[in-house]
């Protein structure tokens, strides 16, 4: 999820060359940027995270901090260095006047500065009346492996670790970084202070109401008795986890972040670093009935972001608000009236609701999956969580209309067996941020580092788009969609798959001169077609041209409109086989779909022809969806004819490897 998401503010403060006292100037041409929370009441002016460039050493961080203090003192300002970061991100946390920001932005090594802001527990209400514990049938829920090889870190409130439900399962670390409680008459009542964290620890690993009954947990206190914390406190907590991991490497680690604040570049960056160090992070999508991309850490792409549903698989309403939604949500999980340990007494249970509870469910499921398969990477785990989810059970009418297509209709579930899914070719759909409406606007969708981009498509609600293409960026393929003049903006949609030992490339055919249309195929030996994209420069793509039909018996070929350039994604991987499946409807139809059959995985989804009345194509689970303009506004019948083209693949290699293991 890009930095330009939502209302996130970026204030670029210009460098003034006349500023004194600089022994080293920043590299020429670079301007450090200042960021702050878009939600004004959550801002914490006076405390700033100064993030230094990636390769900055600890000694340089300390020197830069000292330099800031010295230069501030010369101007008569007091500053206090609260923390020097190293291990995750280089930088420091400083308490200072906002007047010093211009000065700080000019310091050597500075990448950006972010004003501190608040984060909040994501459960409502905190304490209901006590309720009796749930009753379980003897064999109702006896998972084969309770997550015993996995350690789950919980960044939350303090917790009552000797509650009967979690005693011996939770180690309270000595980490604490919380702000003062608001209000002069706030009374710290221990059971209230412990409420949120105790409940979540119970949901993850409780003896009787927990998901991963064998998982051990470690708690870090980053939320105060009112359930409020800071971005900086959370960052220092994440750094503590990284340092613990380095000092004493254990098995797989899951970090549960049942909190949310406004979009934070620095919090997302820290999550990215920790994820790339092999840690699985699970977070609450947020309880604001809003786009999760506007919140952190929910908007961090490397984090597994969880929305909340109820027992009827409907999105959870929380007072006037409810679960967040949108493309930054990975999946949903139970988050309404969830029974768990209550800090009111050592045997009490209580029900709480929210995306915190949903995230705790997924953290528990992740712990169980990792305990069964400790070598799973984050990408593999995320793909499995998506694969085993209940599909298409959420009533999407609850979401705002423009968010429905972006929000995954997935409710987390435990796999039927924690072993034996290795043969599957796993793919997921990743939507980009909206491009914006300018003529040359583009949107980019990216896969995770160890996923392969197997196809790329685009979608525009207005239908005014110029297609999409796969292109190399930083040594990896990305999916870029192009807006058209008068268009309200586009989305790029990447199909991201787990394909070990894959060698993929893009073959392009420029627009054809002849009327037969443009074609491109995979000509390398052993390469198979996994996806087709088309991109055009003209504003209105052949509104009255007849549709191009694929020649029979040429499965490795992409075909498209003669005015478009066509891009074929061609991959070679052990045992990979793919086939093209089409579903054409002669009459105008708002939506045409085609699905891959059991045992095959959808890797590519595109529309034939790519004419302007087609809004775009995208994959939903194993189904390719092609959307067209409202049929009432469509012209002739021939123009209304649309074909959905799915490319379905499977890996015989993965299937064989799985059988050999069994």
């Amino acid at each position: 999820q890009e930095d330009e998401d939502g209302d996130y503010e970026e204030l670029v403060l210009a460098l003034r060359s006349e500023e004194d006292g600089l022994a080293e100037a920043p590299e020429h041409g670079t301007t450090a940027t200042f960021h702050r929370c878009a939600k004004d009441p959550w801002r914490l002016p006076g405390t700033y995270v100064v993030v230094l460039k990636e390769e900055t050493h600890l000694s340089q961080s300390e020197r830069t901090a000292r330099r800031l203090q010295a230069q501030a003192a010369r101007r008569g300002y007091l500053t206090k260095i609260l923390h020097v970061f190293h291990g995750l991100l280089p930088g420091f946390l400083v308490k200072m006047s906002g007047d010093l920001l211009e000065l700080a932005l000019k310091l050597p090594h500075v990448d950006y500065i972010e004003e501190d802001s608040s984060v909040f527990a994501q459960s409502i209400p905190w304490n209901l009346e006590r309720i009796t514990p749930p009753r379980y049938r003897a064999d109702e829920y006896q998972p084969p492996d309770g997550g015993s090889l996995v350690e789950v870190y919980l960044l939350d409130t303090s917790i009552q670790s000797d509650h009967r439900e979690i005693e011996g399962r939770v180690m309270v670390t000595d980490f604490e970084n919380v702000p003062e409680e608001d209000g002069t008459r706030f009374h710290r009542q221990a059971s209230k202070c412990d409420s949120h964290g105790t409940h979540l620890a119970g949901v993850v690993s409780g003896r009787d109401a927990g998901v991963a009954k064998g998982a051990s947990m470690r708690s870090l206190r980053v939320l105060n008795c009112q359930g409020k914390g800071t971005v900086s406190g959370t960052l220092i907590g994440l750094e503590f986890i990284r340092k613990s991991q380095l000092v004493q490497p254990v098995g797989p680690l899951v970090v549960l972040l049942p909190l949310a604040g406004g979009y934070s570049r620095v919090l997302n960056a820290a999550c990215q670093r920790l994820a790339r160090a092999g840690v699985v992070l699970v977070t609450a999508a947020g309880n604001f009935r809003d786009d999760a991309c506007l919140y952190s850490p929910a908007s961090a792409p490397e984090v597994i972001t969880v929305g909340a549903t109820n027992a009827q698989d409907q999105p959870v309403t929380l007072g006037t608000l409810g679960t967040n939604f949108g493309r930054c949500v990975d999946l949903f999980a139970p988050g309404e009236d969830i029974i768990g340990a209550s800090s009111d007494c050592s045997t009490c249970f209580v029900s709480q609701s929210g995306t915190s509870q949903a995230a705790a469910h997924v953290a528990g499921i992740a712990a169980m999956m990792l305990s069964a398969e400790p070598e799973l990477t984050l990408a593999e785990l995320r793909q499995r969580l998506i694969h085993f989810s209940a599909k298409d059970v959420i009533n999407e009418a609850w979401f705002p209309e423009d968010q429905r297509v972006l929000t995954p209709n997935l409710v987390a579930a435990l796999p039927p067996s924690t072993h034996g899914a290795g043969w599957q070719l796993f793919c997921r759909t990743v939507w980009s941020a909206h491009s914006g409406p300018t003529r040359m606007a583009t949107a980019v969708a990216r896969c995770a580092p160890d996923e392969e981009l197997l196809s790329c498509s685009s979608f525009s609600r207005s239908g005014k788009r110029r297609g999409e293409r796969m292109e190399a960026q930083g040594g990896k393929l990305v999916c870029r969609a192009h807006n058209a003049f008068g268009g309200e903006g586009v989305y790029a949609i990447a199909r991201c798959c787990l394909l070990p030992q894959a060698n993929c490339s893009v073959h392009t055919a420029p627009p054809a001169e002849a009327s037969m249309g443009t074609r491109v195929h995979c000509h390398q030996q052993g390469h198979v077609l996994t996806g087709c994209s088309s991109h055009w420069e003209v504003e209105d793509l052949g509104t009255h041209k007849p549709p191009v039909l694929r020649p029979r018996g040429q499965p490795n070929q992409c075909v498209g409109h003669r005015e478009a350039s066509i891009h074929a994604s061609c991959c070679h991987a052990p045992g990979l086989e793919c086939k093209v499946k089409e579903h054409g409807i002669p009459a105008p139809q708002e939506q045409v779909t085609v699905a891959c059959e059991e045992g095959w995985t959808l890797t590519g989804c595109s529309a034939l022809p790519g004419t302007s009345h087609v809004l775009g194509a995208y994959a939903v689970d194993n189904t390719c969806v092609v959307r067209s303009r409202d049929v009432s506004t469509t012209g002739s019948t021939s123009e209304g004819a649309v074909t959905a083209v799915a490319i379905c693949c499977r890996s015989r290699h993965l299937a064989q490897a799985s059988q050999e293991l069994q």
């Epitope: 009753r135 005693e167 009787d208 050592s346």
Partner: antibody
Framework: QIQLVQSGAEVKKPGASVKVSCKAS????????ISWVRQAPGQGLEWMGW????????NYAQKVQGSVTMTTDTSTSTVYMELRSLRSDDTAVYYC????????WGQGTTVTVSS | QSALTQPASVSGSPGQSITISCTGT?????????VSWYQQYPGKPPKLKIY???NRPSGVSNRFSGSKSGNTASLTISGLQAEDEADYFC?????????FGGGTKLTVL
């Protein structure tokens, strides 16, 4: 290693009080409470209650409610169980055990109530 | 009288398997995953053998196993040995407290 060490045997007259101590070591104390269990001669085990080493909260069995008080001294990692208004049927071996799971036990303290 | 019912005595020959039952209600054994089994030698404190229905603490022989069906929990000792002769107690959570069984004396013939 993980240990619970209890105070020595006590002989008390009916109506008196007794205070038994249990010193914990070898594990993070706040992760577990302490349960107290007694066993009358030739009889089974009876759970008396539990105290939190984290916040001092208690949970007493109905049968002994009103006559038992459990306390904790975090500075010495010691938990105490005081039984008041002793009667002859309070004669038993009193055990402290770690948490509700009672996975580690003290060696036991014999309390004899006799006139 | 104990809340959980156990047979007063059970016996078996060396090498045999025996099972001790522990019957409660849906408010204790049937309602929770937290049934434990303890072994006690005369004059000694009890020792945990099984926790959470079927889990063995480290160091406990795999000859000891636990299970539960409905409101009844069971302890099975296979390959009976002379040193298994002792008293065995089950325990379970209730909504607010803990309950023990009356105990079973195991005799190895």
């Amino acid at each position: 290693q993980i240990q619970l060490v209890q105070s020595g045997a006590e002989v008390k007259k009916p109506g008196a009080s007794v205070k038994v101590s249990c010193k914990a070591s070898g594990y993070p104390l706040t992760s577990y409470g302490i349960s107290w269990v007694r066993q009358a001669p030739g009889q089974g085990l009876e759970w008396m209650g539990w105290i939190s080493a984290y916040n001092g909260n208690t949970n007493y069995a109905q049968k002994v409610q009103g006559s038992v008080t459990m306390t904790t001294d975090t500075s010495t990692s010691t938990v105490y169980m005081e039984l008041r208004s002793l009667r002859s049927d309070d004669t038993a071996v009193y055990y402290c055990a770690r948490g509700y799971g009672m996975d580690v036990w003290g060696q036991g303290t014999t309390v004899t109530v006799s006139s | 009288q104990s809340a959980l019912t156990q047979p007063a005595s059970v016996s078996g020959s060396p090498g045999q398997s025996i099972t001790i039952s522990c019957t409660g209600t849906s408010s204790d054994v049937g309602g929770y995953n937290s049934v434990s089994w303890y072994q006690q030698y005369p004059g000694k404190p009890p020792k945990l053998k099984i926790y959470e229905v079927s889990n063995r603490p480290s160091g406990v022989s795999n000859r000891f196993s636990g299970s539960k069906s409905g409101n009844t929990a069971s302890l099975t000792i296979s390959g009976l040995q002379a040193e298994d002769e002792a008293d065995y107690f089950c325990s379970s959570y209730t909504s607010t407290s803990m309950v023990f069984g009356g105990g079973t004396k195991l005799t190895v013939l």
